[in-house]
């Protein structure tokens, strides 16, 4: 039960995280005009990964896309790449994790296969979250550097009567959305990896068959026995013979230590 809960929660947390990463990537407010200690202007500037916008006090907002690819700063291109890689990995991870969910039954999929898929999706979520956090952090670092550079420029070259106001940019809402979303995706991935440990069989999966002697009710169990998940009959438990021979799972199921994770 705990394994399913951990897996399900990991999936939901990752889903929210990836939705957040997509939202952050699409948002225009990665950097916003710094209003502190600045003359009050009737124009508010903000920029995203794909376009820059200007909101006028009168109510008009104008956005212009970055229609050049080569003319953009390498750092911005890197941030775009990191966010896109994060989204792609997260989307694939979600797809894989849907089939890995314990509560969803697909044909006669083995527990070991589900465990592998859970682990794969977990790793994908972790990498996706790290990509998003890295992308947002690189952009934030770029902003901090530019902020102090423009602050220095504000106090130079003002010997003349005419002054030019330098627009400084600070952290926009998208950065915080990206950090939180990346963190959630990362947590979701870790949870999936933890759930995977509970799904994986510890030893080689032998079929334990009980032989019913004609006069006795003693069952002979060869080899080691499979760690049960404690969730009723497994989809792969099939009758071997119509007669006295049954798979061990059909006789009784024992709780394993993994049920208490």
């Amino acid at each position: 039960m705990a394994v399913t809960a951990c897996q399900g929660l990991g999936f939901v947390v990752s889903l929210i995280g990836i939705a957040g990463i997509i939202a952050a990537t699409c948002m225009d407010q990665w950097s916003t005009q710094d209003l502190y200690n600045n003359p009050v202007t009737a124009v508010f500037n903000y920029q995203g990964l794909w376009r820059s916008c200007v909101r006028e006090s009168s109510g008009f907002t104008e956005c212009r896309g970055y229609f050049t690819l080569l003319g953009l700063p390498a750092m911005l291109q890197a941030v775009r790449a990191l966010m896109i890689v994060g989204i792609v990995l997260g989307a694939i991870g979600l797809l894989v994790s849907i089939f890995a969910l314990k509560c969803i039954r697909i044909g006669s999929m083995e527990d070991s296969a589900k465990a592998n898929m859970t682990l794969t999706s977990g790793i994908m979520f972790i990498v996706s979250g790290l990509c998003a956090i890295a992308g947002v952090s690189v952009f934030a670092n770029m902003l901090v550097t530019n902020f102090w550079m423009s602050t220095a420029n504000m106090y130079t070259g003002m010997g003349g009567m005419v002054q030019t106001v330098q627009t400084r940019y600070t952290f926009g809402a998208a950065l915080f959305v990206g950090w939180v979303a990346g963190g959630l995706t990362l947590i979701g991935g870790v949870m999936m990896c933890i759930a995977c440990r509970g799904l994986a069989p510890e030893e080689t999966n032998y079929k334990a068959v009980s032989y019913h002697a004609s006069g006795h009710s003693v069952a002979y169990k060869p080899g080691g026995f499979k760690a049960s998940t404690g969730f009723g009959s497994n989809t792969k438990n099939k009758k071997i013979y119509d007669g006295g021979a049954r798979t061990e799972d059909e006789v009784q199921s024992y709780p394993s230590k993994h049920d208490y994770v």
Epitope: Q33, P39, V40, T41, A42, V43, N45, Q47, S52, C53, V54, E56, S57, S58, G59, F60, E62, R64, V162, Q163, T164, V165, Q166, T167
Partner: antibody, heavy 117, light 113 residues
């Protein structure tokens, strides 16, 4: 079509307060800002202040202490209130709609305000 | 506050002539975000409210004749009337629409001989 109409004209005694209502039609106050401008007789234009779509206001720094602009979106009305009027506040008061570039693209006909005892 | 200085204060020209008037601001009105200058030109005829001619320093308002042209950037701006008509008799104002409080120039009075 877009229209703005100021209430008035008004005769005010010195040190009294002034209230003008600008009733708009053809656009919504939740989408566009309204600005106020005055023009003393034979003189140039003076920007008084503005109330923007979100309800935030900006004022002429020289008049800020005695000027107040508010609005009622449902009634499509903008209100200008000015305290402690003096004779040099005698002017034609205009309300105008904010457009592209924060410019005023539509103007009311103006209302004459005379401050005299 | 931003100071807007207009020159000349008055102009007397004959119909068909080319006219230029200047407007200078004490600070740059150029917004780096969209590379637009927040300077507006108005025309006010006697006994009428002002009429918007040009915004963003060079964009003509719809319905304004193309003989009116705005130019300039940063702190120096110009309004040009390529061929003055009798109906252009008015006072022309420039306005800072970038910094609060918005401020007007003192105006340029255009008179026709």
């Amino acid at each position: 079509q877009v229209q703005l109409k100021e209430s008035g004209p008004v005769l005010v005694a010195p040190s009294q307060s002034l209230s003008i209502t600008c009733t708009v039609s053809g656009f919504s106050l939740t989408t566009y800002g309204v600005q106020w401008v005055r023009q003393p007789p034979g003189k140039g234009l003076e920007w008084l202040g503005a109330i923007w779509a979100g309800g935030n206001t900006n004022y002429n720094s020289a008049l800020m202490s005695r000027l107040s602009i508010s609005k009622d979106n449902s009634k499509s009305q903008v209100f200008l209130k000015m305290n402690s009027l003096q004779t040099d506040d005698t002017a034609i008061y205009y309300c105008a709609k904010g457009g592209y570039g924060n410019a005023m693209d539509y103007w009311g006909q103006g209302t004459s305000v005379t401050v005299a005892s | 506050d931003i100071v807007m200085t207009q020159s000349p204060s008055s102009l007397t020209v004959t119909a068909g002539e080319r006219v230029t008037m200047s407007c200078k601001s004490s600070q740059s009105l150029l917004n780096s975000g969209n590379q637009k200058n927040y300077l507006t030109w108005y025309q006010q005829k006697s006994g009428q409210p002002p009429k918007l001619l040009i915004y963003w320093a060079s964009t003509r308002e719809s319905g304004v004749p193309d003989r009116f042209t705005g130019s300039g950037s940063g702190t120096d701006f110009t309004l040009t009337i390529s061929s003055v008509q009798a109906e252009d008799l008015a006072v022309y104002y420039c306005q800072n629409d970038y910094f609060f409080p918005f401020t007007f120039g003192s105006g340029t009075k255009l008179e026709i001989k």
